[in-house]
């Protein structure tokens, strides 16, 4: 039950995280104009990964896409790449984890397969979260560097004549969304990995050994009680829980109409 809960919670947390990463990637407010020097500006600038925008006090907002690849800073391209990789890995992870969920039965998928899928999706979520955190952190570092550079030479112009007051940019809402979303995806991935351990404890290879008990003898074949079930013989080693007190077949619930989603 705890394993199912951990797996389910990990899935939900990762889902929220990935939705957040997608939202952050699409948001325009990665960097916003620093209003420290001009708190009553009638023009507010903000920039995203894909376009820059200007919001006037009149309510009019104009956004322009970055219609160039070669002209963009390498760091911005790197951040875009990290975020996209994070989204792709996260999406694949979600797809895999849906089939790995213990509460969902797909045909006669065994727990070992579900455990592997849970681990795979968990690792994907962790990498996805790390990509998002890395992407946002790289962008934040770029902002900090540019901020102090523009502060150092606040006024740019020729011959000492003040021409343009440089616009300084500070952290936008998307950065915080990205950090939180990346963290959630990472946490969700860790939870999936923990759930995987619960689904697949250490395998013990049981050899065909005869145990002589008083009165009668029982030969334990590889595969536990599989031979005695109506599903036919199974020659694969099966995991036996609680020191062999009961096999997974004893606790296995048979497919019902509610199991298929």
């Amino acid at each position: 039950m705890a394993v199912t809960a951990c797996q389910g919670l990990g899935f939900v947390v990762s889902l929220i995280g990935i939705a957040g990463i997608i939202a952050a990637t699409c948001m325009d407010q990665w960097s916003t104009q620093d209003l420290y020097n001009n708190p009553v500006t009638a023009v507010f600038n903000y920039q995203g990964l894909w376009r820059s925008c200007v919001r006037e006090s009149s309510g009019f907002t104009e956004c322009r896409g970055y219609f160039t690849l070669l002209g963009l800073p390498a760091m911005l391209q790197a951040v875009r790449a990290l975020m996209i990789v994070g989204i792709v890995l996260g999406a694949i992870g979600l797809l895999v984890s849906i089939f790995a969920l213990k509460c969902i039965r797909i045909g006669s998928m065994e727990d070992s397969a579900k455990a592997n899928m849970t681990l795979t999706s968990g690792i994907m979520f962790i990498v996805s979260g790390l990509c998002a955190i890395a992407g946002v952190s790289v962008f934040a570092n770029m902002l900090v560097t540019n901020f102090w550079m523009s502060t150092a030479n606040m006024y740019t112009g020729m011959g000492g004549m003040v021409q343009t007051v440089q616009t300084r940019y500070t952290f936008g809402a998307a950065l915080f969304v990205g950090w939180v979303a990346g963290g959630l995806t990472l946490i969700g991935g860790v939870m999936m990995c923990i759930a995987c351990r619960g689904l697949a404890p250490e395998e013990t290879n049981y050899k065909a050994v005869s145990y002589h008990a008083s009165g009668h003898s029982v030969a334990y074949k590889p595969g536990g009680f599989k031979a005695s079930t109506g599903f036919g013989s199974n020659t694969k080693n099966k995991k036996i829980y609680d020191g062999g007190a009961r096999t997974e077949d004893e606790v296995q619930s048979y497919p019902s109409k509610h199991d298929y989603v």
């Epitope: 009553v40 009638a42 600038n45 820059s52 006090s57 009149s58 309510g59 322009r64 021409q163 343009t164």
Partner: antibody, heavy 118, light 113 residues
Framework: DVQLVESGGGLVQPGGSLRLSCAAS????????MHWVRQAPGKGLEWVAF????????YYADSVKGRFSISRDNAKNTLFLQMNSLRAEDTAVYYC???????????WGQGTLVTVSS | DVVMTQTPLSLSVTPGQPASISCKSS????????????LTWYLQKPGQPPKLLIY???TRESGVPDRFSGSGSGTDFTLKISRVEAEDVGVYYC?????????FGQGTKLEIK
Amino acid sequence: DVQLVESGGGLVQPGGSLRLSCAASGFTFSSFGMHWVRQAPGKGLEWVAFISSGSHTIYYADSVKGRFSISRDNAKNTLFLQMNSLRAEDTAVYYCARFQYGNSFDYWGQGTLVTVSS
Amino acid sequence: DVVMTQTPLSLSVTPGQPASISCKSSQSLLNSGNQKNYLTWYLQKPGQPPKLLIYWASTRESGVPDRFSGSGSGTDFTLKISRVEAEDVGVYYCQNTYSFPLTFGQGTKLEIK
């Protein structure tokens, strides 16, 4: 057709109060920021106050800060300017104006005259 | 506050002749985000409210004759009338629309000779 009609002007004694109104029609009032601009007799234009479309942002000129209050009723398509502690230097024609892109004032009312005198 | 200084304060022009009004701001009105200058020009005819002529320093408002043109960037701006007509008389104002308070210039009175 866009129309802005100011009202509420008149003669008032120094220290008195007055409430100006600006009735808007011909456009979606709730989508536009609005301003009050004044012009003293024979003088130039002086910006007075601004209110954003949803009343979230309000700015005042230093000369009226603390004495004047701008507000709006989007349901009634009306802009207001509550003027308290009036001084002789507040005597002017008060115009309401609509805010448009470029942060420009594209439509102006005909103005209402406020005279502060004892 | 941004101080707007207009020159000349008065101008007398013969119909058909060009006219030019200068406007200087104490701070740059150029917004780096969209590379637009937040300066607006208005014309106030006698007994009327002001009328919008040009915004973003050079964009003509719809319905404004093409003889009116705006130019300049940063702190120096100019309004040009290619051929002055009798109906162009009035006071021309430039306005800072970059930061509050949205200050106006003192105005330039255009008269016909």
